[in-house]
């Protein structure tokens, strides 16, 4: 038994860091293997993490950590059995994946502008919770080249547009997710959708 | 908001025992590791003790064997029982969170060593 | 056990002057576990940079960080009424534990 694609990890930057690897051939993930997982850190102690598969040859497992911190660095082991396959290590910090924003909402009461609203995935007392920047993708359910993004840079987590930008008497839907850029970490995972009906009222023509 | 809110401090006699408290609010207590840091009158700060989320301790070696560092996650309080107490422990103790730094600390609570 | 010597023990200077805090240790300190606090009268200690050059949440950027290996500063590069104040530098080993310089006392001329 070997390691084909040695683990790679991101971490959300708050209690979970995901990694994942190829091995040889068919592996049953739960059975055969455990990650070993410790903070390079006086007061830690080492963790067991038991993978799942993730299709034939791949696993993945799900670490629990404490709070993440910049300095913060994991000695990883991967055993099968008493057997050491990879020795590695991992800096939370320089593998971020932000948590998806979540409660996303569209207010259409709001004369002819639509306010969208979605929460921080982070609790105030976390770094990435002031750090977070976002995109939201909306689109029509009627036409797939009626898609755009609109890119929030400001720390609000919402956005207002004008209805009249999108096509009246129509559906459309919305998806948000997020990024730090203090981390150059990569996109979140789309926060799930949320559709509405757009209407609004069209200008009278002058004649 | 990150709140520690100490108590416990008092007057105590040479050889006596005292237990201080801190109550943990607005982060998750369990995924953080806490200290115990002292100031004698008119000195510095002392780093004395500190516990990891596992349970995990360690102690300055001024007060090894005498004071006892432990946790209750499910109070989110953090504790130092003290024991076998000095002259030389007088001081005030701060309750932290932190890692490698302090970045959260409690207000602080005066223990009193006299006869 | 890292010792952490900090000079000069008081810094006597007025509002609006540069500060400057050195903080020597015996060994060499990763950059990553230099942390600088203040401390006023009665109050408890405030984190003020992590990493040596980090500042901490909410923090002026009036104060900043700098140094790696054995030397480390906190400059304070205006100052302000309220940053008259006790100044402590603190490393973190992994086998040590965790450690203080003495202080550095800033206070108006």
């Known amino acids: 038994m070997k390691v084909l694609q040695e683990p790679t990890c991101v971490s959300d930057y708050m209690s979970i860091s995901t990694c994942e690897w190829k091995m040889n051939g068919p592996t049953n993930c739960s059975t055969e293997l455990r990650l070993l997982y410790q903070l390079v850190f006086l007061l830690s102690e080492a963790h067991t993490c038991i993978p799942e598969n993730n299709g034939g040859a791949g696993c993945v497992c799900h670490l629990l950590m404490d709070d993440v911190v910049s300095a913060d660095n994991y000695t990883l082991d991967l055993w099968a059995g008493q057997q050491l396959l990879w020795k590695g290590s991992f800096k939370p910090s320089e593998h971020v994946k932000p948590r998806a924003p979540g409660n996303l909402t569209v207010h259409t009461n709001v004369s002819d502008t639509l306010l969208l609203t979605w929460s921080n995935p982070y609790p105030p007392d976390n770094y990435l919770y002031n750090h977070l920047t976002y995109a939201v993708n909306i689109w029509s359910e009627n036409d797939p080249a009626d898609f755009r993004i609109y890119n929030v840079t400001y720390l609000e987590p919402s956005l207002r547009i004008a209805a009249s930008t999108l096509k009246s008497g129509i559906s459309y839907r919305a998806r948000v997710r997020a990024w730090a850029q203090c981390y150059n970490t990569t996109w979140s995972e789309w926060s799930p959708s949320t559709k509405w009906h757009n209407s609004y009222r069209e200008p009278f023509e002058q004649h | 908001e990150v709140q520690l809110v100490q108590s416990g401090g008092g007057l105590v006699h040479p050889g006596g025992s005292l237990r201080l408290s801190c109550a943990g609010s607005?982060?998750?207590?369990?995924?953080?590791?806490m200290f115990w840091v002292r100031q004698a009158p008119g000195k510095g700060l002392e780093w004395v003790s500190g516990?990891?989320?596992?349970?995990?301790?360690n102690y300055a070696d001024s007060v090894k064997g005498r004071f006892t560092i432990s946790r209750d996650n499910a109070k989110n309080s953090l504790y130092l029982q003290m024991n076998s107490l000095r002259a030389e422990d007088m001081a005030v103790y701060y309750c932290?969170?932190?890692?490698?730094?302090?970045?959260?600390w409690g207000q602080g609570t005066l223990v009193t060593v006299s006869s | 056990e890292i010792v952490l010597t900090q000079s000069p023990g008081t810094l006597s200077l007025s509002p609006g002057e540069r500060a400057t805090l050195s903080c020597r240790a015996s060994?060499?300190?990763?950059?990553?576990?230099l942390a600088w606090y203040q401390q006023k009268p009665g109050q408890a200690p405030r984190l003020l940079i992590y990493?040596?050059?980090s500042r901490a949440t909410g923090i002026p950027d009036r104060f900043s960080g700098s140094g790696s290996g054995t030397d480390f500063t906190l400059t304070i590069s205006r100052l302000e009424p309220e940053d008259f104040a006790v100044y402590y530098c603190?490393?973190?080993?992994?086998?040590?534990?965790?450690?203080f310089g003495q202080g550095t006392k800033v206070e108006i001329k």
């Open positions: 932290a969170r932190g890692r490698y730094y302090f970045d959260y």
């Open positions: 607005g982060f998750t207590f369990s995924r953080n590791a």
């Open positions: 516990i990891g989320t596992g349970g995990a301790t």
């Open positions: 060994q060499s300190v990763s950059s990553s576990y």
């Open positions: 990493g040596a050059s």
């Open positions: 603190q490393q973190y080993d992994h086998s040590a534990g965790w450690t």
